[in-house]
Interface confidence: low
């Protein structure tokens, strides 16, 4: 099976416009890709199967995203903390300032379309 | 001030491993990754990987993964890389390198380096 | 891999000219808009030193005289007015993805 976790945190250092509202624009497909990239970096493990329905709002840039694991591979505290783990590495290794972390189990059954 | 001092020159037959210290001093050691490198005679710079001491992750270069590896020990803030089954190409001078954030913490760069260690690989 | 291409290998100017270094990145070595690219000066016999960051930022203690410029692929190191001390090897290295690479390195020379 799988576990799937949602995932709200604020970039404190980009600016939001109103190309992170269409998908179409460089801009959102730069920063998906960027922030795919970095969580492929956090969640290394074998448990890590991806993410989707990134979505960006105002607020400085607030992400929102949808976690996937192997089922009892991890659990909502221990996704929370290895996020907040590597805040310091995103700062440096993607020039990003996080803030508000927010993680929360995702009842199934689970639609990829919501 | 941030210094790191690496130990000194090593020659050594082909086949056999060589372990390079690197001692950091001058600021906090654990949360940041340290570099690296090496250029061999006459040549350019060349990455070989890192590791971020605090945890023990390390990053490495895949045309040296299986024959090299970074430890850490934070007790005497001190990392090392050690390269096995040497052969004459490996002749080089291997630098460690601080990958550091300016005194705003804004940017982060490999801002300081070792003095360098000197392998030699000959029979 | 992303490669760094460094030109020209070789520069000889007179002091007092300028100096232009060009990278160039296999592909797109910026995140999130910053360019994670960063020049540095080798001397003989001595360890590389920091000069730019992040493409334009000059280091700490190093003179004005040196500066950077470029986005994405194309990048510049400029020295403003050559002085007999800047005679090294400077390389750009991209931190964009690992592995990390250097360029060739250009060789700047005092005619």
């Known amino acids: 099976g799988v576990s799937f976790f949602f995932l709200s945190f604020h970039i404190s250092n980009l600016q939001f416009n109103s190309s992170l509202e269409d998908p179409s624009t460089d801009y959102y497909q730069e920063l998906q890709r960027d922030i795919s990239e970095m969580f492929l970096q956090i969640y290394k493990q074998g448990g890590f199967l991806g993410l989707s329905n990134i979505k960006f709002r105002p607020g400085s840039v607030v992400v929102q995203l949808t976690l996937a694991f192997r089922e009892g591979t991890i659990n909502v505290h221990d996704v929370e903390t290895q996020f907040n783990q590597y805040k310091t590495e995103a700062a440096s290794r993607y020039n990003l300032t996080i803030s508000d972390v927010s993680v929360s189990d995702v009842p199934f059954p689970f639609s990829a379309q919501s | 001030e941030v210094q790191l001092v690496q130990s000194g020159a090593e020659v050594k037959k082909p086949g056999a491993s060589v372990k390079v210290s690197c001692k950091a001093s001058?600021?906090?050691?654990?949360?940041?990754?340290i570099e690296w490198v090496r250029q061999r005679p006459g040549q350019g710079l060349e990455w070989m990987g890192e590791?971020?001491?605090?945890?023990?992750?390390?990053n490495y270069n895949e045309k040296f993964k299986g024959r090299v590896t970074f430890t850490a020990d934070t007790s005497t803030n001190t990392v090392y890389m050690e390269l096995s089954s040497l052969r004459s190409e490996d002749t080089a001078v291997y630098y460690c390198?601080?990958?550091?954030?300016?005194?705003?913490?804004?940017?982060?760069?490999?801002?300081?380096w070792g003095q360098g260690t000197t392998v030699t690989v000959s029979s | 891999d992303i490669v760094m291409t460094q030109s020209p290998a070789t520069l000889s100017l007179s002091p007092g000219e300028r100096a232009t270094l060009s990278c160039r990145a296999s592909?797109?070595?910026?995140?999130?808009?910053?360019?994670?690219i960063h020049w540095y000066q080798q001397k003989p016999g001595q360890a590389p030193k920091l000069l730019i960051y992040h493409a334009s930022n000059l280091e700490t203690g190093i003179p004005a005289r040196f500066s950077g410029s470029g986005s994405r692929t194309d990048f510049t190191l400029t020295i403003s007015s050559l002085e007999p001390e800047d005679v090294a090897v400077y390389y750009c290295l991209q931190s964009r993805k690992i592995p990390w690479t250097f360029g060739g390195g250009t060789k700047v020379e005092i005619k």
């Open positions: 390198a601080r990958y550091g954030d300016d005194t705003s913490g804004g940017y982060y760069a490999v801002d300081y």
């Open positions: 590791i971020l001491p605090g945890t023990g992750r390390t």
């Open positions: 001058g600021y906090r050691f654990i949360p940041y990754w």
């Open positions: 592909e797109s070595v910026n995140i999130l808009g910053t360019n994670l």
